[in-house]
Structure formats: C-alpha cells, structure tokens
C-alpha cells in the first residue's frame, strides 16, 4: 500500500512533469513561435486510455518524436534545450510508471498535433494530481 510519503513524492513528480509540459506548450502554442505552422504538421500518437501511472508508457514512447519537433523551435526566444528537457521528462516518467511491470501501450486510431498531444498529457497529470490531493 502506498505510504503518505510515497504519495507526496508521486504528487511532486507529477507536478514537475506537468510544469515541464505546460512550459513546452507555452513556448510552442504562441503566435511568436516562428515554426508553429510547421510544427503543427507533425503527428503524434495518443493513448487509447490514460487514467493510471502505468499509461505513462504511451508518453515515454513519444518522447523521441517530441524532441525532434522541439529541435525545430530552437531560437533566441525558445530557451529550453530539447535534449535536456526530454531527458528530464524521461527520468520523471520512468520513476512514475515504475519498471516492475511491462505495459503494452494501446494507441487511439486518430493521431494528434503537438498541441493536442501536450494538452492530453497535461490533462492526465492534472487528473492524477487531483486524485492524490
């Protein structure tokens, strides 16, 4: 059974992940982003179901494509280093989903834009956080 300290740790990790995803979204989904139109042409796989921490496997599998799209956004106004950022997200995701059980991710039929993709995982984080608090 999860202890209050492990629940608190999970909550903090989710909040960190949430902040990273929101920061990326703010940098991308903005009229000041010169590459926005191009970035919206890239397609991302969405999870069929995302209600538990194990479903973060679906996010993990899309981190490489996410990094590739973020590399497009590199400019004086986009201060994040995609490699470092994705690496940080990857560490958090691995800790949250755990490595004990192997989970096969099921994807929805429809692909999504980077904005829809990020919004989906932001909603996921917010939803899990609300169940922990």
């Amino acid at each position: 059974a999860p202890t209050s300290s492990s629940t608190k740790k999970t909550q903090l990790q989710l909040e960190h992940l949430l902040l990273d995803l929101q920061m990326i979204l703010n940098g991308i989904n903005n009229y000041k982003n010169p590459k926005l139109t191009r970035m919206l042409t890239f397609k991302f796989y969405m999870p069929k179901k995302a209600t538990e921490l194990k479903h973060l496997q679906c996010l993990e599998e899309e981190l490489k494509p996410l990094e590739e799209v973020l590399n497009l956004a590199q400019s004086k106004n986009f201060h994040l280093r995609p490699r470092d950022l994705i690496s940080n997200i990857n560490v958090i995701v691995l800790e949250l989903k755990g490595s004990e059980t192997t989970f096969m991710c099921e994807y929805a039929d429809e692909t999504a834009t980077i904005v829809e993709f990020l919004n989906r995982w932001i909603t996921f984080c917010q939803s899990i956080i609300s169940t922990l608090t």
Partner: antibody, heavy 126, light 111 residues
Framework: QVQLVESGGGVVQPGRSLRLSCAAS????????MHWVRQAPGKGLEWVAV????????YYADSVKGRFTISRDNSKNTLYLQMNSLRAEDTAVYYC???????????????????WGQGTLVTVSS | DIVMTQTPLSSPVTLGQPASISCRSS???????????LSWLHQRPGQPPRLLIY???NRFSGVPDRFSGSGAGTDFTLKISRVEAEDVGVYYC????????FGGGTKVEIK
C-alpha cells in the same frame, strides 16, 4: 506619440462583408506585430487575430477562422481586417492593438497590447 | 485555450482605501523563454483598454505606483493601494504565454 486609429465600422446585414482599417503613427510600424481585439456591447474582451511584423504569419481565434482575414500594408502603416460572412454575434467594437517588437534577426521584445486604438463599432443586423 | 478567471466580478470600494483583484489561469503561464506573460488592463467607460501591468509585476510607462501586480504560476493579484476616482472602470487580466485570452473583468466602482 503612438497613435492607432480604426475606421470602416458600420451597420451591415448578416452574410455580408466589411473591411476595417487601422492607421498607425508614432512608431516604426513594420517592426511590430499587430492584433485585432473585439468587445461585444456590455461584454468582455475577445482576441480576434494577430499578424507578424512582416505579414508572413497570421493567426485567428476559432470563432472567426475561415471568415476573417488580417493583413497589413507596411508602406502605408495600415492594418486591415477583412470580415466576410458576418453574423449577429460579430457585433462589437473592434480595436487594433500593438504587439511585440521584432528586431532584424526575428527576436521579439516588448509587450503585447501596450497601445490600443479608440475602436470602431460593427453592427451586424437585418 | 487557457481560461482566465477573475474574482470578484464587482468590487465597490471607498476612495482612499485599498482594492485587490484576483486572477487564476487554467494553465501555468511560465513560458519557455523564462517569462510569465500575465498582464493587467484597465478600461474606463466608453474608452479603450490601457495596459497597466505586464509580466506579472512591471508597471507600464505612466502608470501610478499605487498599482502593483504579484503572483506566479497560475495565481495573480492586482492591488490598488489607495483608490482614486479615476480608477473606476473594468480591470482585465490577460495572458499571452499562449494565444491571448482575457479574464471576464472586474468592475471597480466607488461606494
């Protein structure tokens, strides 16, 4: 000093078109992004559209996408909003507002919405 | 879209007394460039809005120092230290961290 003056508003029937203009002075128009924002009578503010300093990138609110077109003529220091297929819910005061400043390398500075025009009223009614 | 929620809807104040308006965003507003693009606007009756505060706490040129902004992440506050007659009108928070969205407005009126 910075001045933005809107014109072109009026009463128009549903389904018809209208073109708004915003004449800018007191700053280097060609280095700033520009916005249109509207305000329905007695209501709050709603962002409508933005155009980059060079006119290349344009973005719209979902409520006007496909019906409105933002454009600019940097040689005339003028911003435009072409409004087609007008609906009753488009009735509002339309404001132009200055956006961020861009330098020669495309780096942006400054604040969005730092200066606003007085607005022009568009009434869509049969 | 980021939803901006302002409270209160209306604020009757006494001249010379302080006033405070809150604004909450549905998303954290920190941008990838390190800034938080949260602004406050003031609109007097029959006039266009004017910029008061930008990037949470920076006063725009010509704005009196009785106006101050604070906050971080998703929660922001505009304070007027001593309300003057010219301060009546509607105050809007707005974000430009993503595509611009405005709060619903808070009407400040004299009691």
């Amino acid at each position: 000093q910075v001045q933005l003056v809107e014109s072109g508003g009026g009463v128009v029937q549903p389904g018809r078109s209208l073109r708004l203009s915003c004449a800018a002075s007191g700053f280097t128009f060609s280095t700033y992004a520009m916005h249109w924002v509207r305000q329905a009578p007695g209501k709050g503010l709603e962002w409508v559209a933005v155009i980059w300093y060079d006119g290349i990138n344009k973005y719209y609110a979902d409520s006007v996408k496909g019906r409105f077109t933002i454009s600019r003529d940097n040689s005339k220091n003028t911003l435009y909003l072409q409004m087609n297929s007008l609906r009753a819910e488009d009735t509002a005061v339309y404001y132009c507002a200055r956006g961020s400043y861009y330098d020669s390398s495309g780096y942006y500075y400054g604040e969005d919405f730092d200066y606003w025009g007085q607005g022009t009223l568009v009434t869509v009614s049969s | 879209d980021i939803v901006m929620t302002q409270t209160p809807l209306s604020s009757p104040v006494t001249l010379g007394q302080p006033a405070s308006i809150s604004c909450r965003s549905s998303h954290n507003l920190i941008h990838s460039d390190g800034n938080t693009y949260l602004s406050w606007l003031h609109q007097r009756p029959g006039q266009p809005p004017r910029l008061l505060i930008y990037k949470i706490s920076n006063r725009f040129s010509g704005v009196p120092d009785r106006f101050s902004g604070s906050g971080a992440g998703t929660d922001f506050t505009l304070k007027i230290s001593r309300v003057e007659a010219e301060d009546v009108g509607v105050y809007y928070c707005m974000q430009t961290s993503q595509f611009p969205t405005f709060g619903g407005g808070t009407k400040v009126e004299i009691k």
